[in-house]
């Protein structure tokens, strides 16, 4: 036959060759020829590449910078990147998580829907009427008013999205 | 167009040292390939010495034992043959080769 | 060694007859990769070796598609559908799979 103009899956055209691309974790130094393979060589310390390749280099892992308030989630290997995530408290502003910011707190009036993970951020929801937050929290849940009732008491006070009810004792029906 | 070159002494006494050069042309010896020396004693077949990659290491054909040495001079893209303790046994037209190309051949005699 | 043995050694054949040249190596020629590194060269009479085929069945450029070469493992065939008379010379087979790199003892090719 003539020589390939396609070739097979993990293989690439070159010179009219058809090479053996490299394997995850190591590096191109040679293309093949009419007489040798391909050639590769394993990534270095803190290096990888995750697919079939034929790159003259690796790439760097990346570095999860603590002043960014990055700490590292999963250590990367020859053959994958390291998997950053955010220090307690903080989340990733990105999907790549390259810097994190602290998570948002629920001002009075909400309450936290969802706490914020190290991908994600606090979210919050406005207290319906018969809860109350009266706190900024990246914790706390809108909380129920106070049942006077159940204490045997009556509401002196209404209570808000922010505040809680206030409750006192019935008033005596004088004879 | 690829193109190779032997040069060097066409009669070398017995005992002493055999040397040849490889001038290539039209590609660069660090580039790729392996460039091997290749000879053919009068009347009979091919045989495979060793190679210089393009990396610079090197493989030899354990017959010849410890008397071969391939070198370079990537600074004059050339590869160099050195074959000690020559015997008429030697005496042979001697090819540098990256295999799909070939030089002409060079005739090295060895005689006193 | 790989040793490489070629049959037959001498060849007659009429114009626009086919050839056909064995080659037979003394250990699998496939490498790790499922790649076999078996090429075959004619020298023509006063010349260097010209690669033809090379990993068993693929035409080097410029070479006739006359030329075919087949096998795997340890047997390989270089046929020449309809010879002609400048493909005459001595035909040979090369190993590079396994160091030391071996050459079968050629094949003689005449015309009628």
């Known amino acids: 036959p003539e020589p390939p103009t396609a070739c097979r899956e993990k293989q690439y055209l070159i010179n009219s060759q058809c090479c053996s691309l490299c394997q995850p974790g190591q590096k191109l130094v040679s293309d093949c020829t009419e007489f040798t393979e391909t050639e590769c060589l394993p990534c270095g310390e803190s290096e990888f590449l995750d697919t079939w390749n034929r790159e003259t280099h690796c790439h760097q892992h990346k570095y999860c910078d603590p002043n960014l308030g990055l700490r590292v989630q999963q250590k990367g290997t020859s053959e994958t990147d390291t998997i950053c995530t955010c220090e307690e408290g903080w989340h990733c502003t990105s999907e790549a998580c390259e810097s994190c910011v602290l998570h948002r707190s629920c001002s009075p009036g909400f309450g936290v829907k969802q706490i914020a993970t190290g991908v994600s951020d606090t979210i919050c929801e406005p207290c319906p009427v018969g809860f109350f937050s009266n706190v900024s929290s990246a914790f706390e849940k809108c909380h129920p008013w106070t049942s006077c009732e159940t204490k045997d008491l009556v509401v002196q006070q209404a209570g808000t999205n922010k505040t809680d009810v206030v409750c006192g004792p019935q008033d005596r029906l004088r004879a | 167009e690829v193109q190779l070159q032997e040069s060097g002494p066409g009669l070398v006494k017995p005992s002493e040292t055999l040397s040849l050069t490889c001038t290539v042309s039209?590609?660069?010896?660090?580039?790729?390939?392996?460039w091997n020396w290749i000879r053919q004693p009068p009347g009979k077949g091919l045989e495979w010495m060793g190679y210089i990659r393009y990396d610079g290491s090197n493989n030899y054909n354990p017959s010849l034992k410890n008397r071969i040495t391939i070198s370079r001079d990537t600074s004059k893209n050339q590869f160099s043959l050195k074959l000690s303790s020559v015997t008429a046994a030697d005496t042979a037209v001697y090819y540098c080769?990256?295999?799909?190309?070939w030089g002409q051949g060079t005739t090295v005699t060895v005689s006193s | 060694d790989a040793v490489m043995t070629q049959t037959p050694l001498s060849l007659s054949v009429t114009p626009g007859q086919p050839a056909s040249i064995s080659c037979r190596s003394s250990?699998?020629?496939?490498?790790?990769?499922?790649?076999?590194?078996l090429n075959w060269f004619l020298q023509k009479p006063g010349q260097s070796p010209q690669l033809l085929i090379y990993?068993?069945?693929n035409r080097f450029s410029g070479v006739p598609d006359r030329f075919s070469g087949s096998g795997s493992g340890t047997d390989f065939t270089l046929k020449i559908s309809r010879v002609e008379a400048e493909d005459v010379g001595v035909y040979f087979c090369?190993?590079?799979?396994?160091?030391?790199?071996?050459f079968g003892q050629g094949t003689k090719l005449e015309i009628k």
């Open positions: 990993r068993v069945s």
């Open positions: 250990q699998s020629l496939e490498n790790t990769n499922g790649n076999t590194f």
């Open positions: 090369l190993q590079v799979t396994h160091v030391p790199f071996t």
């Open positions: 039209g590609y660069s010896i660090t580039s790729n390939y392996y």
């Open positions: 080769a990256r295999l799909d190309y």
